[in-house]
């Protein structure tokens, strides 16, 4: 906490400029008007303030806006955002995607911090749902963002937003999350033709039920083994040998290398040996 002291003669700041880097913390506290700071926040990031000087500037804003900063200030926080606590951020009302982008840019290249997680949570809750533009933005900065959400939170994603999802965005999703996302993807891509549909739906198939896998097996999709290994075991078990052969196409030979791993292992054990022998892969049920 900086002591309240009078500003020395001639040092009162008339604007936020580089001369302030030479001010001691107590001088910043005494000589910089909080309202001036709020209107010139965009300049702060162009000036090499030390971390402790930034603490003083934050303190001045906190005093000016005890109920939370207005968005006009938030949008220009820049590196000062890194000084904010989740408690500070919970007081904010962030509605502009531009503000969100500006603050995510500050944290770019780092893991998602508690501050960023709180900011995103406030933003999404304010919007009521995870729309396409927001999802586009969030997955661009944090490819794993989608998979960090609970199934309940994912249920607020409208099918139209699924178009923004890239395969890598789903890399860390677990089956419960894919169970929620798959029906949305199916709805989003329903008007696409066979091959294009498969390219889009492929990343979501970890949430597909048996009947959809059966339908895909009729469409010459040539699913790769990596995708097959991510399918739900309970969805794979009822498939016949012929259906799996059609589903995988030329990739069916890969079953041999995966025969000890789920879901292949469990599927093999459910099949008649005669049927497995038709594959000519030496699989033992």
């Amino acid at each position: 906490e900086v002591e309240k002291t009078a500003c020395p003669s001639g040092k009162k700041a008339r604007e936020i400029d580089e001369s302030l880097i030479f001010y001691k913390k107590w001088e910043l506290e005494a000589c910089v008007d909080a309202a001036l700071l709020a209107t010139q926040m965009d300049r702060v990031n162009a000036i090499p303030f030390t971390y402790e000087q930034l603490d003083v500037l934050k303190h001045k804003l906190d005093e000016l806006y005890p109920q939370g900063y207005p968005e006009s200030v938030i949008q220009h926080l820049g590196y000062l955002f890194l000084k904010m606590s989740p408690e500070d951020i919970r007081k904010w009302n962030v509605t502009s995607l531009e503000t969100l982008k500006a603050l995510l840019e500050v944290n770019k290249g780092h893991e998602m911090s508690p501050q960023v997680a709180t900011l995103i949570d406030r933003f999404v809750k304010g919007r009521g749902q995870l729309d396409k533009d927001t999802l586009d933005t969030l997955t661009a900065f944090y490819p794993g963002y989608l998979c960090s959400l609970s199934p309940e939170e994912l249920s607020s994603v409208p099918p139209s937003s699924i178009w923004a999802v890239r395969p890598q965005d789903l890399d860390t999703c677990d089956p419960r999350q894919l169970d929620v996302l798959y029906p949305k993807a199916r709805l989003a891509f329903q008007n696409m033709n066979g091959s294009e549909y498969f390219v889009k739906i492929q990343s979501f198939l970890g949430g597909a039920p048996t009947e959809d896998l059966k339908a895909l097996s009729q469409q010459n999709v040539s699913m790769d083994l990596a995708t097959f290994m991510k399918l739900r075991t309970d969805a794979v078990l009822p498939l016949t040998v012929a259906e799996v052969q059609k589903l995988l196409g030329p990739h069916v030979e890969g079953l041999k290398a995966e025969e000890r791993h789920r879901p292949v292992r469990d599927w093999i054990l459910r099949q008649r040996q005669d049927d497995l022998d038709t594959l000519g892969l030496g699989l033992q049920g």
């Epitope: 880097i21 090499p48 030390t50 402790e52 000087q53």
Partner: nanobody, 122 residues
Framework: QVQLVESGGGVVQPGRSLRLSCAAS????????MGWVRQAPGKEREFVAA????????YYADSVKGRFTISRDNSKNTLYLQMNSLRAEDTAVYYC???????????????WGQGTLVTVSS
């Protein structure tokens, strides 16, 4: 004790270029910025340029933007200031600084060089 030694100053005509160097006698740990500050005769000190730790962010005073470039060579422990299109008003003593102290650039634990004089005159 780390020392900063500036070099490269001198007399130069307007419109010409000069490159200042600042060599550190040892590795400076934990600095937040390395930068250049200048002081013209009878005037206040003025920030010129700075570079943050890890060369993540570059800062320039409005008066030198587009003309001066700050850089550093970690392998040589040296900071540079490339000054192009020099003007008479750039005449000053240029100081190199390593900012470690949280209490501003005038904090007690920062390192400063002795300065090198740049005179821009026809």
């Amino acid at each position: 004790q780390v020392q900063l030694v500036e070099s490269g100053g001198g007399v130069v005509q307007p419109g010409r270029s000069l490159r200042l160097s600042c060599a550190a006698s040892g590795t400076i740990f934990g600095y937040q910025y390395m930068g250049w500050v200048r002081q013209a005769p009878g005037k206040e000190r003025e920030f010129v340029a700075a570079i943050s730790y890890g060369s993540i962010t570059y800062y320039y005073a409005d008066s030198v933007k587009g003309r001066f470039t700050i850089s550093r060579d970690n392998s040589k422990n040296t900071l540079y200031l490339q000054m192009n299109s020099l003007r008479a008003e750039d005449t000053a003593v240029y100081y190199c600084a390593a900012i470690l102290d949280g209490d501003g650039w005038d904090g007690g634990y920062n390192y400063w060089g002795q300065g090198t004089l740049v005179t821009v005159s026809s």
